[in-house]
Interface confidence: medium
């Protein structure tokens, strides 16, 4: 059977495309074809005679097509236009007439596209911003990147216009991205320049740092502020509630005591209209700012259950600190048996239980700083344990609780509560 | 109706020129290629020029390289070859026609016109 297959089916204009021609049959007198889907003279393209090889122009030639001797039509510099069926007449030496129709399409070779958007400078959850892919063109698809990356799905992206407008509902700063649209249809593809969108945000509340509270005397004051902010912020410093200065950093040499009190930087951005402010209490001391280690000094390490007590110290040079008792990572004390004396130094057990057997150590702070102690090893022991709380394993003996006494692992689970109190030691 | 018209043929010596036109009628030559091909007795046809107008293209055969130059007038509708440095091989009819411009085939002969190199 006649058939007429297009090479390429979608082409582009400004290209070719070539109507070729299968099972075309033998003994020919000649062929025409014409635009559309069936013979109509006002509609030949071109007709050719095989004796004498020569083409002949219809109404319809444009001086774009060639006929070949196989009768497949080239049709170059292709036109909008020319899309659509085109039909192949095939006159046989009997004068039997056979006829076959194909088609091809026509796409336009995409422009370059851009992108128009309806606000240079959206402003943090509050602006929209609407991307709209340049120019419009029938037939294409428009597809979007953000920072060369599919669209990510979100509630606050829609797409609207056949894809061709991409908007941004309640812009956040996460959203300045580089952004590109691409137009595509079945013979070219084409992306545009990228457009960075420039969110408007800020200031945030502002980080003063170093985050230190507490100063010496005589030492250096330097406080920097900062807050995320576009554009930039304007920084400006309060001390006590009266403005200082209008930059980002703050200064003061040689400090005394009457410089401490509150240092307010207060953060201010002109274009969203939008101002923050942190509070930072500054305390210029005499206070040491490094602690020393202490040392513990036990009257007995090693003690008899139910009979001894015992007292820790918690020896320091160290003045203006407080002092508290850790054992098993719990503050003490924890029990009626337990007291602190002399301003928390001493940590007296009486009488000593099977429980209180484990680590203890002290740690000494103040307002600026704090170290702790080596930590030291109670043991406690008992004379005469009832033998039927005796196992022996291996030889070994081992107390295993009974009438209600728990194992000397599992006894400390009981929560701590901190006691503070405020030693002051005089050389 | 749709003519092509060859002109410009005739006698000249080996190494001289001759400038051969081709007016157009019945469509734009801005649409489509034309090239100018030859025929001469016992020697295959030979196509040894195209211009694309509407690509922006010229192409050649070897034989002609460096000798031969298409161009065209969109304004006149008219195909022109200029030849120099003729060569007595180069005796041939040279026909107008509507070529492909990528594919070894050609329509709608004018009647042409004879170039004749010979001393």
């Known amino acids: 059977k006649l058939t007429i297959e297009s090479t390429p089916f979608n082409v582009a204009e400004g290209k070719e495309v070539l109507l070729l021609v299968h099972n075309l049959p033998q003994h020919l007198f000649g062929y025409s074809w014409y635009k559309g889907e069936r013979v109509d003279g006002n509609r030949q393209i071109i007709g050719y005679v095989i004796g004498t090889q020569q083409a002949t122009p219809g109404p319809a030639y444009s001086g774009r097509e060639i006929i070949y001797p196989n009768a497949s039509l080239l049709i170059q510099n292709i036109i909008q236009n020319d899309t659509g069926f085109y039909t192949l007449h095939v006159i046989k030496s009997d004068l039997v007439n056979e006829e076959a129709t194909g088609q091809f399409r026509v796409y336009p070779e995409l422009p370059k596209p851009s992108i128009s958007s309806n606000n240079s400078k959206p402003v943090e959850d509050k602006d929209a911003v609407a991307f709209t892919c340049e120019p419009e063109t029938q037939d294409a698809t428009y597809l979007w990147w953000v920072n060369n990356q599919s669209l990510p799905v979100s509630p606050r992206l829609q797409l609207s216009n056949g894809n061709r407008t991409l908007t941004l509902f309640n812009v956040t700063r996460n959203d300045s991205a580089s952004y590109k649209c691409e137009t595509q249809n079945p013979v070219s593809a084409r992306r545009s320049d990228s457009v960075i969108l420039n969110v408007l945000y800020g200031p945030d509340t502002p980080t003063i740092s170093p985050s230190d509270t507490y100063y010496r005397p005589g030492a250096n004051l330097s406080l920097s502020c900062y807050a995320a902010s576009n554009p930039p912020a304007q920084y400006s410093w309060l001390i006590n509630g009266t403005f200082q200065q209008s930059t980002q950093e703050l200064f003061i040499p040689n400090i005394t005591v009457n410089n401490s009190g509150s240092y307010t930087c207060h953060a201010n951005n002109s274009v969203t209209g939008c101002n923050r402010t942190t509070v930072k209490t500054i305390i210029v001391t005499e206070l040491s700012p490094v602690v020393a280690k202490p040392q513990i000094k036990a009257s007995k390490t090693t003690v008899t259950g139910d009979k001894d007590s015992v007292n820790l110290t918690c020896s320091t040079n160290d003045t203006g600190i407080s002092i508290r008792w850790f054992f098993k990572n719990q503050s003490l004390p924890s029990s009626e048996r337990m007291k602190l004396s002399q301003g928390n130094i001493t940590l007296s057990i009486n009488p000593v239980k099977r429980e209180d057997a484990g680590t203890y150590w002290c740690e000494v702070f103040n307002p600026i700083s704090k170290n702790q102690s080596d930590p030291i090893m109670l043991n406690v022991n008992y004379n005469a344990l009832p033998q039927e709380n005796l196992i022996n394993v291996d030889e070994q003996l081992y107390f295993q609780g009974g009438s209600g006494l728990n194992d000397i692992f599992e006894a400390q689970k009981i929560e701590w509560h901190e006691a503070r109190a405020h030693h002051h030691h005089h050389h | 109706e749709v003519q092509l018209v060859e002109s410009g043929g005739g006698l000249v010596q080996p190494g001289g020129s001759l400038r051969l036109s081709c007016a157009a009628s019945?469509?734009?030559?801005?649409?489509?290629?034309i090239g100018w091909v030859r025929r001469a007795p016992g020697k295959e046809e030979e196509l040894v020029a195209q211009?694309?107008?509407?690509?922006?293209?010229?192409r050649y055969a070897d034989s002609v390289k460096g000798r031969f130059t298409i161009s065209a007038d969109t304004s006149k509708n008219t195909a022109y070859l200029q030849m120099n440095s003729l060569r007595a091989e180069d005796t041939a009819v040279y026909y107008c026609?509507?070529?492909?411009?990528?594919?070894?085939?050609?329509?709608?002969w004018g009647q042409g016109t004879t170039v004749t190199v010979s001393s």
């Open positions: 026609a509507i070529v492909g411009q990528n594919y070894p085939v050609y329509n709608y």
């Open positions: 211009i694309c107008q509407y690509h922006g293209s010229t």
């Open positions: 019945g469509f734009n030559i801005k649409d489509t290629c």
